[in-house]
């Protein structure tokens, strides 16, 4: 059971427009969809192909597109097919043909008062109407003696006389669009004494200084005259020349002649000639100095041997068109061959290292010469000079690694680190020569390290496995200022690294031995109850057979950390009173006491005349205000630690007392009255 | 005859779901693009989504205002189609509709089942 | 999304009277279009497919033209048993979508 969902539906469709036809199909299986036009299955195109199971047209075509189209849809497992409706197109078109002579049957026939029909052949669907012109002036039907029968596609002209000679065209419009006459008709109906074009003068193109020559004839009966203007409507005669043309020659058969042209002569030159009846005839021609511009300069260019490869010439600006040519050691190129010339572009075909070189396009004409070089280099594969090796680099100290090859061009070189691209900074530096710098190498620098040499030709690559030699160094190095707190236990670790791995012991700095409850464990000082007598200096040491030993000193304190004994406490104050927080710690070395109050320090040397902070740590404001809320923190430190203490500090308005309060109604809250 | 019965509306909670079931006999089920459409009460017509036959993977479409909430699906062994509510809204309450339509030869059909009510409320 | 818009939204006539109901899409849905009858209580019934056909057993009386985007649904004389509301749908493009609807009254 096939069903279609959409079916194709006929419709208007513009010649060369889109359009599409839509089928839609839905079945129990698998399907394939293809369509019929007039019961042949449709092939596809580019033009015309399916989209899904639609059929789509690029550009709608009158003839190959006209036709019932069907949508077939096949169920190849059961052979059940099913056929939609049948869809068409209304295909709307015009298409331009020529004016051409329907009566007489030649042009040699026609004579003065003879009837002449001259036919458009201009078709379309919708038909289209149609409009005559003759000079590219409009005609209107009932116009002095022609008719137009747009049914016929006709204009006669009865009887034709010489005042209907010249261009006819026509032009017809539709619901498509419009179109106009491929090729127009000229006729010519003599009359003796009409002024005829015998020779029309041509557009010269002219080098700077050279002459040049218009000819221009009339012929008529009585002769008719003739004369030249240029431009400015000026007359051009044997005695009467305009100051620019002073060196212009009219001779006696109409033809005129200037001798070394300058720019100022360039123009429009009008030949006109007057029967003794009729229009006057004006011919015109132009005369254009000769020109050309500079060429745009090539990009050297990398080819590679073995491809085939173009270079454009694009050609100067230039009048005339300047004619192009490429040459290469001197030596013009052929049109054919492996290196050659097509058009205006190089061809090299499989090339070869001898074709590298400088090849020259050059363009000419009239007004001179230019030519432009592009520099071909054949690209090679890179070949080594020296490969990087594997290495034993010392922690510390920069480490390099080779990668020299050579090629055309310059070969570019990258290097990779466990295949992830090295980016040159402060660590890493690859020279022009390609030889990879480590500035400081650290011990995760031992890993593998590949370098790849490039070219457009191809590449190279190599690796090589760096293996650090690490110094004999403190993992980290122990503080050499450290605390202790006085009658508990403590711990100073030491741990170090190297090639070897090393042994760590300590030793007081006087060399006296360790007391008993003090123990060095594999690097760790252990002190088990401080005592006072254990303050003083200390050396870690750490030594291997290789690299010998290491020492870091340390300055050992012992102290009595900090404790507070009295603690600021929450406070809230009237405005303008005065606020008192306390703070007292002990500890030895003895604490100094600093405040922050709102997240800055308070300097005591800045505090001003409202705050100050006594030799116990306590802190007074006087007069405070609303802006003195907020937390206030009491910080003790010494020489071994630090400790910090907050409260906050609420500064309010004074209640106004009611009546029914008695003077000794308490505060609402705790407060601090001064 | 033709026949569409949808089953398993009812009232449930904002959040809460529900499964519809439209049952088919009378026509070849399996070859047809089944869609649902919903009405909410004194409202207009509402497409909701639909599943396409075999012959076109069982493609599913929905409207944008269920998107990610219901689910289409069909068994051609039972002739049945269902939607699957998820995440139900209050602005879900309808009657909602099975229906199939297309060209079989060349005589246009277009099937509707009675409808089920489904009530979102808390 | 294609919007349909129907008009009118609702439409009084005489039995008798020639009635159009009007469609129009957002964009271009060639003759993809259906006319649905609906009455209260009952399931939307077909009426006109492919914006012109009318549909198997559908009295004569209905008729639908139109392309592209703009559609007529006309009841050439009205009937007692025609109260109803109308809807136009297009099936050009998913989502498929429908207009808003016409209440057919008598008055």
């Known amino acids: 059971a096939i069903v279609f969902i959409k079916q194709p539906s006929s419709q208007d469709a513009l010649q060369g427009r889109r359009a599409l036809l839509r089928c839609e199909v839905e079945a129990p299986g698998p399907v394939h969809v293809y369509w019929l036009l007039d019961g042949a299955p449709v092939q596809d195109t580019e033009r015309r192909f399916a989209q899904g199971s639609s059929l789509s047209f690029a550009a709608v075509d009158r003839l190959q597109d006209s036709g019932t189209f069907q949508c077939v849809a096949r169920d190849d497992v059961t052979g059940e097919e099913a056929r939609s409706a049948n869809a068409s197109f209304n295909i709307k078109w015009i298409e331009a043909g020529p004016v051409v002579l329907k009566h007489p049957a030649s042009e040699a026939e026609i004579q003065p008062q003879t009837q002449v029909t001259l036919r458009c052949h201009i078709d379309g669907h919708p038909r289209p109407t149609y409009q005559w012109f003759r000079d590219g002036t409009p005609l209107s039907d009932g116009q002095s003696n022609h008719t137009v029968s747009s049914k016929e596609r006709n204009l006669t002209l009865r009887p034709a006389g010489p005042e209907h000679s010249g261009l006819y065209s026509c032009c017809a419009h539709s619901a498509f669009g419009q179109a106009c006459s491929s090729q127009n008709f000229t006729l010519s109906i003599a009359d003796e004494s009409f002024a005829r074009v015998v020779l029309a003068p041509q557009d010269v193109v002219v080098a700077r200084y050279e002459e040049a020559m218009f000819h221009c004839q009339f012929s008529a009966q009585p002769p008719p005259s003739l004369q030249w203007l240029f431009e400015d409507e000026t007359p051009i005669t044997n005695r009467s020349r305009p100051p620019h043309l002073r060196r212009a020659t009219v001779f006696a058969n109409g033809s005129l002649l200037l001798t070394q042209v300058r720019p100022r002569n360039a123009g429009i030159y009008r030949c006109i000639g007057q029967g003794q009846r009729g229009p006057p005839i004006i011919l015109e021609a132009t005369l254009h100095l000769a020109e050309i511009e500079d060429m745009p300069l090539f990009e050297p260019r990398v080819f590679t041997a073995g491809s085939e490869e173009r270079v454009t010439c694009l050609p100067p600006k230039g009048l005339p068109e300047p004619s192009v040519w490429w040459e290469h050691a001197g030596v013009r190129l052929p049109t054919h061959g492996r290196v050659y010339q097509k058009g205006h572009e190089l061809v090299l075909a499989n090339i070869a290292e001898s074709d590298a070189g400088v090849y020259t396009c050059h363009a000419a004409n009239l007004a001179g010469q230019r030519r432009q070089d592009v520099n071909i280099t054949v690209a090679t594969v890179p070949s080594w000079l020296k490969k990087p090796q594997d290495s034993q680099l010392e922690e510390g100290k920069p480490g390099y690694l080779d990668c020299l090859t050579q090629a055309t061009p310059k070969p570019t070189v990258v290097w990779y680190r466990n295949q992830m691209l090295i980016s040159e900074d402060s660590r890493f530096e690859v020279f022009k020569n390609g030889t990879l710098r480590i500035n400081s190498v650290e011990v995760y620098d031992g890993t593998w390290y590949r370098c790849m040499s490039s070219t457009p030709a191809g590449s190279i690559e190599a690796q090589a496995r760096v293996q650090v030699l690490e110094k004999l160094k403190f993992t980290p190095p122990p503080q050499p200022q450290q605390c202790m707190e006085f009658d508990k236990e403590a711990t100073v670790p030491c741990s170090a690294t190297g090639r070897e791995k090393p042994t760590i012991k300590w030793e007081r700095a006087d060399g006296s031995s360790l007391p008993e409850w003090v123990t060095d464990n594999a690097g760790t000082l252990h002190f088990a109850r401080v005592t006072r007598d254990d303050a003083g200096n200390y050396t870690c040491i750490a030594s291997n057979g290789p690299q010998g030993q290491i020492r870091a000193h340390v300055q050992l304190t012992v102290a009595v950390f900090i404790t507070f004994k009295v603690e600021p406490e929450r406070t809230t104050v009237y405005q303008g009173h005065t606020a008192l927080l306390q703070c007292e710690a002990q500890g030895d070395p003895k604490p100094l006491i600093q405040w922050k109050g709102k997240d800055r320090i308070l300097d005591p040397t800045k505090l001003g005349p409202r705050m100050h902070i006594f030799q116990n740590g306590s802190l007074v404001i006087h007069d405070v205000a609303p802006e003195d809320s907020g937390r206030y923190t009491c910080i003790a430190g010494n020489s071994c630690n630090i400790k910090h203490t907050e409260a906050p500090l609420y500064v309010v308005d004074k209640p106004v007392p009611e009546e029914s309060e008695g003077p000794g109604s308490p505060p609402p809250y705790k407060m601090i009255q001064t | 005859e033709v026949q569409l019965v949808e089953s398993g509306g009812g009232l449930v909670q904002p959040g809460g779901s529900l499964k519809l079931s439209c049952a088919a006999s009378?026509?070849?089920?399996?070859?047809?693009?089944m869609h649902w459409v919903r009405q909410a009460s004194g409202k207009g017509l509402e497409w909701v989504g639909r599943i396409r036959s075999k012959a076109n993977n069982y493609a599913t479409t929905y409207a944008a205002s269920v998107k990610g909430r219901f689910t289409i699906s069909r068994d051609d062994s039972k002739n049945t189609a269902y939607l699957q509510m998820n995440s139900l809204k209050t602005e879900d309450t309808a009657v909602y509709y099975c229906?199939?339509?297309?060209?079989?030869?060349?005589?246009?059909?277009?099937?509707w089942g009675q409808g089920t009510l489904v009530s979102v409320s808390s | 999304d294609i919007q349909m818009t129907q008009s009118p939204s609702s439409l009084s006539a005489s039995v008798g009277d020639r009635v159009t109901i009007t469609c129009r899409a957002s964009?271009?849905?060639?003759?993809?279009l259906n006319w649905y009858q609906q009455k209260p209580g009952k399931a939307p019934k077909l009426l006109i497919y492919?914006?012109?056909n009318l549909d198997k057993g559908v009295p004569s009386g209905f008729s639908g033209s139109g392309s592209g985007t703009d559609f007529t649904f006309t009841i050439s004389s009205l009937q007692p048993e025609h109260i109803a509301t109308y809807y136009c749908?297009?099936?050009?493009?998913?989502?498929?979508?429908f207009g808003q609807g016409t209440r057919l009254e008598i008055k």
């Open positions: 009378g026509f070849t089920f399996s070859g047809c693009a």
């Open positions: 964009q271009d849905i060639s003759n993809y």
């Open positions: 492919d914006a012109s």
């Open positions: 749908q297009q099936y050009d493009n998913l989502p498929i979508t």
């Open positions: 229906t199939s339509r297309g060209y079989s030869g060349f005589d246009w059909f277009d099937y």
